[in-house]
């Protein structure tokens, strides 16, 4: 019989206190006087003194109002002792359950919630979730069960109910069509949380819904027609800046313009880029324009965005009429580099060629000519006709001025425009070889022994070109053939000089005549040092001294 059922006590009781809750009773009180006491948190340990017991009657007392949100359940022990203090019962467990009262309002976890949703989404799309808490009990009562609702929406555009909220979870969703960032970029919702599952206390907060940009607006040219003037031949010249307006979010891919020349640029003369700040289309020349060929270009430019359109949108097109302005253009030699074959050594005053320039301009301008660079000073140019004549001896073999048979001259043409312009041309004279050089032996000094002499092989060179070179022929003159012999080898490009009679040690002149395939003859004196020696020698030995 020493038991007590769990005791339920409502929180926030108004008393009067102490308030009798239940009576502890031991059936041992028939035999002896019993004294009752309680222990545990809420009695003799913190929070002390909430509960007490009438020592002699066993009445369990509540001394003050309870707060379920602070302590929802107390676990105490009841004790029964006799007059002499001896325990007459085992300690008894006393459970006191604090029952809830709806004494707390819901509280939103934030004063302002922020969420976002893309403009133009389907109704039903989830936006964000809001949360409110309520300290009251939501398990055994509805005191802490929160129901969410939207109290108001600002602006009320295009409908006053663009959003809905899940009454239990606080999830906000789009409910209506017509979210348009360009009209309403942000909605402010006043949201409510009401306890008792919607029938109790209410609290409010704000949910701000940002409408995110979708590329649902096409960029539009403003104006759509342009006229521009560009000097001919200018490359990289800014022709025109094209302006567009786009209702989408500035500096976003849905706003940034992409330009495309759709037509009118057959020669690929123009290019268009987007200015990173202004979003304007900058039309420039990729190649020089030619006034004489075409003095007006009509371009058609289309504009889209970096981001694709989210729906089918009509694209805007601009028309740009580009007027090409005439400029005084430099005369152009035709061809820019002229190759002319001319025989070397032609007489002074002999014509070489006529080299003229054409003026791209339509007016009949007068062109005058002059030589700009003539390293050897061999040529003259008529200022009116462009006739080039020889004033010096053109020498193909002149290694200082001629490279690979070519003599390079730069000429200049000047028009009589205001201001005058000049153009240059290159004249490449390919000098045709003439047999104007005889063969020459190398070396022209030899050293030879007067006893058992070694044959001296001399290389034959000729500055001219074939066929004015080998095979060569050799002949000794001026009695040189008394002591020497000269024979050309089989290939005809070397001469072998041999001493055929004894000569005493000394230096001698050997007169050697060489002729080329075109019979051009060249006499060369070979200095021959004869030494007193046998066979091969490079320098004469000094006089022998005995010891």
């Amino acid at each position: 019989d020493w038991v007590v059922a769990p005791i339920s006590v409502p929180e926030n009781g108004k008393g009067p206190f102490p308030q009798r809750l239940n009576q502890l009773k031991s059936n041992k009180d028939r035999d002896t006087k019993i004294f009752y006491s309680i222990t545990g948190p809420g009695a003799d340990s913190p929070p002390e003194g909430v509960f007490a017991v009438e020592k002699e009657t066993g009445w369990l007392l509540l001394n003050k109002p309870l707060d379920r949100e602070e302590i929802a359940k107390y676990e105490l022990f009841g004790h029964a002792v006799s007059e002499n203090g001896a325990s007459v019962e085992d300690p008894m467990n006393i459970s006191i359950i604090v029952t809830d009262q709806n004494d707390h309002k819901p509280k939103f976890t934030q004063d302002t919630f922020r969420g976002s949703v893309l403009e133009g989404v389907l109704p039903g799309t989830s936006v964000m979730q809001v949360t409110a808490t309520d300290e009251d009990d939501a398990i055994y009562t509805y005191n802490g069960v929160v129901a969410y609702s939207i109290h108001s929406q600002e602006p009320k555009d295009p409908h006053d109910l663009m959003f809905t909220i899940h009454r239990s979870t606080g999830t906000i969703s789009v409910i209506s069509s017509g979210l348009d960032r360009e009209k309403v970029p942000e909605y402010t919702l006043t949201i409510q949380a009401t306890d008792m599952d919607g029938d109790g206390s209410t609290t409010t907060a704000v949910a701000v819904v940002e409408i995110l940009d979708a590329n649902d607006n096409a960029p539009m040219f403003d104006p759509q027609k342009y006229e521009a003037h560009v000097p001919e031949n200018a490359v990289g010249h800014e022709v025109q800046r094209l302006t567009v307006t786009d209702l989408d979010a500035p500096n976003s891919p849905a706003w940034r313009a992409t330009y495309l020349i759709m037509g009118g640029d057959d020669g690929d003369h123009f290019t268009i880029t987007t200015h990173p700040e202004s979003n304007q289309g900058i039309l420039t020349t990729r190649k020089g324009l030619d006034f004489e060929a075409k003095n007006q270009h009509t371009l058609y430019v289309e504009v889209t965005n970096e981001a694709p359109f989210v729906l089918k949108l009509p694209t805007s097109t601009a028309t740009i009429v580009v007027h090409v302005e005439d400029v005084n253009e430099a005369p152009v030699f035709v061809p820019p580099s002229k190759v002319v074959e001319v025989q070397e050594g032609i007489p002074t005053g002999e014509p070489v060629c006529v080299y003229t320039a054409e003026d791209p301009d339509k007016e009949n301008q007068k062109i005058s000519y002059r030589i700009l660079r003539d390293p050897a000073g061999w040529l003259a140019m008529d200022p009116d006709s462009g006739q080039v004549t020889a004033v010096g001896t053109l020498d193909r073999e002149d290694e200082q001025f001629v490279r690979n048979n070519i003599y390079e001259v730069m000429v200049l043409a000047m028009d009589n425009g205001s201001p005058p312009t000049t153009g240059t041309g290159t004249l490449l004279l390919t000098l045709i070889d003439v047999n104007d050089h005889g063969p020459v032996p190398e070396p022209r000094q030899i050293t030879i022994c007067n006893q058992s002499p070694v044959r001296q092989v001399l290389n034959i060179t000729d500055k001219d070109l074939s066929p004015h070179t080998s095979p060569f022929q050799a002949q000794l003159t001026d009695d040189s053939d008394i002591y020497w012999t000269a024979e050309v080898n089989e290939e005809g490009d070397t001469v072998v000089l041999s001493l055929k009679k004894f000569l005493k040690q000394d230096t001698y002149d050997v007169h050697l005549s060489l002729s080329d395939h075109g019979n051009k003859e060249q006499l060369t004196v070979i200095r021959a040092t004869v030494c007193d020696c046998h066979g091969h020698v490079e320098t004469c030995p000094g006089p022998w001294k005995g010891g």
């Epitope: 133009g120 989830s126 899940h166 979708a214």
Partner: antibody, heavy 117, light 111 residues
């Protein structure tokens, strides 16, 4: 008067394709999300697909995902449903309807699509 | 199996009143006040008769009314008339796809 008028239904073999159109009049078509709902013979209503007013956002029921494509041309005030790889279970009356404010209204008169060999 | 539960059929005599129930869950009917009712005559398209639980579109008779309690919505028709004989479908907005759930439909017979 607000009106939706479907066209393009008919008989098609399994695996075949069909395109339904829905011409809208009497309201600002581009301002409203649109949907397709179907009803198999003797059965209830099934939401098939939806598209936002701009056409930038779409939804498909699992049963048709990957086979059906919803689109719209706001310049022509017309909604489309391209149906590919059709199956016998796609046989139904197909309705177009405006979708918003948690409801479907108005509805077109419906077009019968029969998938049979 | 439909997401929302409706009785397969109800009947009533002319002049009587009937009620059709539509039971969902706390994520659809219970969560939002976006329950709609549609009337469908044989061979015709569905026609909206109630939206947002109890709002009648213009042109719909005031004999049709709606209510909601917890996870169950109801359609009431008073003063039954022969032309009320039709199939009635409820629908509810729901959190998450597919956003619209339909009931299986209720056949109303006017005796």
């Amino acid at each position: 008067e607000v009106q939706l008028l479907e066209s393009g239904g008919g008989l098609v073999q399994p695996g075949g394709s069909l395109r339904l159109s829905c011409a809208a009049s009497g309201f600002t078509f581009s301002s409203y999300a649109m949907s397709w709902v179907r009803q198999a013979p003797g059965k209830g209503l099934e939401w098939v697909s939806a598209i936002s007013g701009s056409g930038g956002s779409t939804y498909y029921a699992d049963s048709v995902k990957g086979r059906f494509t919803i689109s719209r041309d706001n310049s022509k005030n017309t909604l489309y449903l391209q149906m590919n790889s059709l199956r016998a279970e796609d046989t139904a009356v197909y309705y177009c309807a405006s979708w918003g404010d948690g409801t479907l209204n108005p509805w077109g008169q419906g077009k019968m699509v029969t998938v049979s060999s | 199996q439909s997401a929302l539960t409706q009785p397969a059929s109800v009947s009533g005599s002319p002049g009587q009143s009937i009620t059709i129930s539509c039971t969902g869950t706390s994520n659809d009917v219970g969560a939002y006040n976006y329950v709609s009712w549609y009337q469908q005559h044989p061979g015709k398209a569905p026609k909206l008769i109630l939206s947002e639980v109890n709002k009648r579109p213009s042109g719909v008779s005031n004999r049709f009314s709606g209510s909601k309690s917890g996870n169950t919505a109801s359609l009431s028709i008073s003063g039954l008339q022969a032309e009320d004989e039709a199939d009635y479908y409820c629908s509810s907005f729901t959190s998450g796809l597919p956003w619209v759930l339909f009931g299986g439909g209720t056949k109303l017979t006017v005796l």
